[in-house]
Interface confidence: medium
């Protein structure tokens, strides 16, 4: 089946927008919007640190580290609260992202 | 095997402070949050805290809510509780437990110690 | 909080059912922990819903229907015997998520 200009394939995401704040010192807020087109029982997550479809239970459960969000080498660690994860280098660097 | 030994427990005065620590062995301590769960005499099981698996992040049950402080190290195996302004409805036994998952939660403990028994009263 | 009976008794080889309702945080899960008397450790036999240690028997059994947990006990055994707790999270805009327990279900066999 061929894809229309624009179309995504099933079950794929593609990012539209990215911003980065660096102006606080040892703090950069990353943001970043995506567009996915996922299959029934899918939604719209992060694995690898890309845009993925997830399964739709992770996110339901805010079971964030089920989706292997962190790359590959990094340790996950939810967030108390399930707002969000962490992603622990080996070198000890932490990054965080909460969900909106 | 899993085991959790905790230690610190005994006879603590009013308005006093107590530090609990709990030895972690059998798995990978780094890789499991952890948790403090505890039991007054005759009583049921209540919620007191837990940490997640770097250490950053904590949360505390409404009772002991701005006077305890959950801590660990991951070299040591160790999570420590920390416990301020003791009053006598902190007495019980204190367990120590480990989450089964990528995070701990009520439903998600899979393994528990042995417990450590904490006595307020002047 | 989590509403759990107070009491069930059974004969041995019957079969024992414990329910939990309530909790804020069904999608995560139920959790039943068995303590044989008031001065021992818990003991973890289900936990996210229908997961059971590798120590824990197979009659050991969870299942969920809605907001309702059900511990079964299939062909329960005098060593059985034991107060069971059931656990859960709420939510509360102060303190988050906070874990929860039942007030405990003490079983007699027969």
């Known amino acids: 089946q061929f894809l229309k200009e624009g179309q995504l394939a099933a079950g794929t995401c593609e990012v539209i927008a990215a911003h980065r704040d660096s102006s606080q010192p040892r703090r950069t807020i990353a943001r970043q919007t995506a567009r996915c087109a996922c299959r029934k029982g899918q939604i719209a997550g992060t694995t690898r640190a890309r845009p993925a479809c997830v399964d739709a239970r992770i996110i339901k459960t805010k079971q964030w580290c089920d989706m292997l969000p962190c790359l590959e080498g990094e340790g996950c660690d939810l967030l108390i609260n399930r707002s969000g994860w962490t992603c622990t280098q080996p070198g000890g660097r932490i990054k965080t992202t909460t969900v909106s | 095997a899993v085991t959790l030994d905790e230690s610190g427990g005994g006879l603590q005065t009013p308005g006093g402070a107590l530090s609990l620590v709990c030895k972690a062995s059998?798995?990978?301590?780094?890789?499991?949050?952890m948790g403090w769960v505890r039991q007054a005499p005759g009583k049921g099981l209540e919620w007191v805290g837990v940490?997640?698996?770097?250490?950053?992040?904590?949360s505390y049950g409404s009772a002991v809510k701005g006077r305890a402080t959950i801590s660990r190290d991951n070299g040591q195996s160790t999570v420590r509780l920390q416990l301020n302004n003791l009053r006598a409805e902190d007495t019980g036994t204190y367990f120590c437990a480990k989450g089964s998952a990528s995070y701990i939660t009520a439903a998600t403990i899979d393994a528990w110690g042995h417990g450590t028994e904490v006595i307020v009263s002047s | 909080a989590l509403t759990q009976p107070s009491s069930v008794s059974a004969n041995p080889g019957e079969t024992v059912k414990i329910t939990c309702s309530g909790g804020?945080?069904?999608?995560?899960?139920y959790g039943w922990y068995q303590q044989k008397s008031p001065s021992s450790a818990p003991l973890t036999v289900i936990y996210w819903n229908d997961k059971r240690p590798s120590d824990i028997p197979s009659r050991f059994s969870g299942s969920k229907s809605g907001s309702t947990h059900t511990l079964t006990i299939t062909g329960v055994q005098a060593e059985d015997e034991a107060v069971y707790f059931c656990g859960n999270d709420d939510y509360s805009s102060d303190s988050g998520y906070v874990g929860v327990f039942g007030a405990g279900t003490t079983l007699t066999v027969l």
């Open positions: 940490i997640n698996k770097s250490g950053s992040d904590t």
């Open positions: 804020g945080s069904s999608g995560y899960g």
């Open positions: 059998g798995f990978t301590f780094s890789s499991y949050q």
